[in-house]
Interface confidence: low
């Protein structure tokens, strides 16, 4: 039930823990030595989008045929571990997180696709995927190495009103510049009585410069 089994029977069992009494830091430090638990793989790094959305896959190697699975996302930052969200699902069915949860997810076989929303720069940290095979017995627990999610607050787009003033000024300037050029050209042509030539065409800038809308997440899968 705890990650304290090494006190009683060392590393002789390849079974998973049933509960979570010790801190995650302790757990992560000792699980490779003492608790050869169910393997859980997740990407090492994910960059959240500028809208604060991060997605990653949590894959577990099921040692048996589980019908009820519980997935928990834990966040570790500065040795503090907090539960971000959790969902229990029956194999073949969808994950259902609480309505007010910042997590959503879908399951496919032994894979869970997790999406965490509403992340800010201060939410940067290690997000650990914990998978429990709840039923039928025996119970298994697997913990991933964690996905480092980097959240970068995007540079704010320039103020739209300010942009309009700039565009108006530039457009006006260009209009008067082209008007002036046309007038000068016409007067020269009239003086020379030469055929009419076309005025100068200047490509206008777009009405509003495109801000960078989204950083594409990338990840490095762990084998």
């Amino acid at each position: 039930m705890a990650c304290l089994g090494f006190q009683r029977h060392k590393a002789q069992l390849n079974l998973a823990t049933r509960t979570w009494p010790c801190t995650l830091l302790f757990f992560l430090l000792f699980i490779p030595v003492f608790c050869k638990a169910m393997h859980v793989a997740q990407p090492a790094v994910v960059l959240a989008s500028s809208r604060g959305i991060a997605s990653f896959v949590c894959e577990y190697a099921s040692p048996g045929k589980a019908t009820e699975v519980r997935v928990t996302v834990l966040r570790q930052a500065d040795s503090q571990v907090t539960e971000v969200c959790a969902a229990t699902y029956m194999m073949g069915n969808e994950l259902t997180f609480l309505d007010d949860s910042i997590c959503t997810g879908t399951s496919s076989g032994n894979q869970v696709n997790l999406t965490i929303q509403g992340l800010r720069a201060m939410d940067t940290g290690l997000y650990i995927c914990k998978v429990e095979l709840m039923y039928p017995p025996p119970y298994y627990l697997g913990i991933g190495n964690g996905t480092q999610i980097y959240v970068i607050d995007p540079e704010p787009c320039p103020d739209s009103d300010f942009l309009l003033w700039i565009l108006a000024a530039v457009s006006s300037g260009l209009f008067f510049y082209s008007f002036l050029l046309t007038a000068v050209s016409l007067s020269k042509m009239l003086k020379k009585r030469s055929p009419l030539t076309t005025g100068v065409y200047v490509k206008m800038p777009p009405t509003e410069p495109e801000c960078e809308k989204q950083f594409q997440p990338y990840f490095i899968p762990i084998n």
Epitope: M1, R8, L15, G64, P137, P138
Partner: antibody
Framework: VQPGRSLRLSCAAS????????MHWVRQAPGKGLEWVVV????????YYAESVKGRFTISRDNSKNTLYLQMNSLRAEDTAVYYC??????????????WGQGTLVTVSS | PGEPASISCRSS???????????LDWYLQKPGQSPQLLIY???NRASGVPDRFSGSGSGTDFTLKLSRVEAEDVGVYYC?????????FGGGTKVEIK
């Protein structure tokens, strides 16, 4: 207790971190062998019952009080037994029932 | 006393899980006492259990061996499968000393 009546058993735990362990109730009818009754997960979220008590017995726990409960309703004569609470020694892995209570005799008779 | 003894336990279904462990425990209930754990997962001796007790077997056939029986070993020995609910105990084997 009379048939059809209810009874609640308590098991007070000490000497270990109660909230870390799953707990079982096992019973033994007079002169008979051991019969597993029910298990409750460390956090109380999962409970599994033997068919013979399903729908009549309810297991619960109060981790703040380090106490395990067994609510027995609609008692029958065949429920007469010594009831033991047992700790599931799954510290790290499944490891059997390593601590047992001293047992409580429940007699159902009219 | 001092003689070896063995108790067998046979399951109708295999207790060998895909993780490689046999979900079978052995318990001893001494007269007038609560049961006590001897062996878990087929062959793992519980804490404080003398090394004269050993468990072996896999799948459906299991054996509890006592290398030399002592007076304190008398009682009823139960095997229990813990692979799936409902957990079930064997009928028990009574060990007495002549």
């Amino acid at each position: 207790v009379q048939p059809g009546r209810s009874l609640r058993l308590s098991c007070a735990a000490s000497g270990f971190t109660f909230s870390n362990y799953a707990m079982h109730w096992v019973r033994q009818a007079p002169g008979k062998g051991l019969e597993w009754v029910v298990v409750i997960w460390h956090d109380g979220n999962n409970k599994y019952y033997a068919e013979s008590v399903k729908g009549r017995f309810t297991i619960s726990r109060d981790n703040s009080k380090n106490t395990l409960y067994l609510q027995m309703n609609s008692l029958r004569a065949e429920d007469t037994a010594v009831y033991y609470c047992a700790r599931d020694q799954g510290t790290g892995w499944y490891g059997g029932f390593d601590f047992w209570g001293q047992g409580t005799l429940v007699t159902v008779s009219s | 006393p001092g003689e070896p003894a063995s108790i067998s336990c046979r399951s109708s279904q295999s207790l060998l899980h895909s993780n490689g462990y046999n979900y079978l425990d052995w318990y001893l209930q001494k007269p007038g006492q609560s049961p006590q754990l001897l062996i878990y997962l087929g062959s793992n001796r519980a804490s404080g259990v003398p090394d004269r007790f050993s468990g072996s077997g896999s799948g459906t056939d299991f054996t509890l061996k006592l290398s030399r029986v002592e007076a304190e070993d008398v009682g009823v020995y139960y095997c229990m499968q813990a692979l799936q609910t409902p957990l079930t105990f064997g009928g028990g084997t009574k060990v007495e000393i002549k």
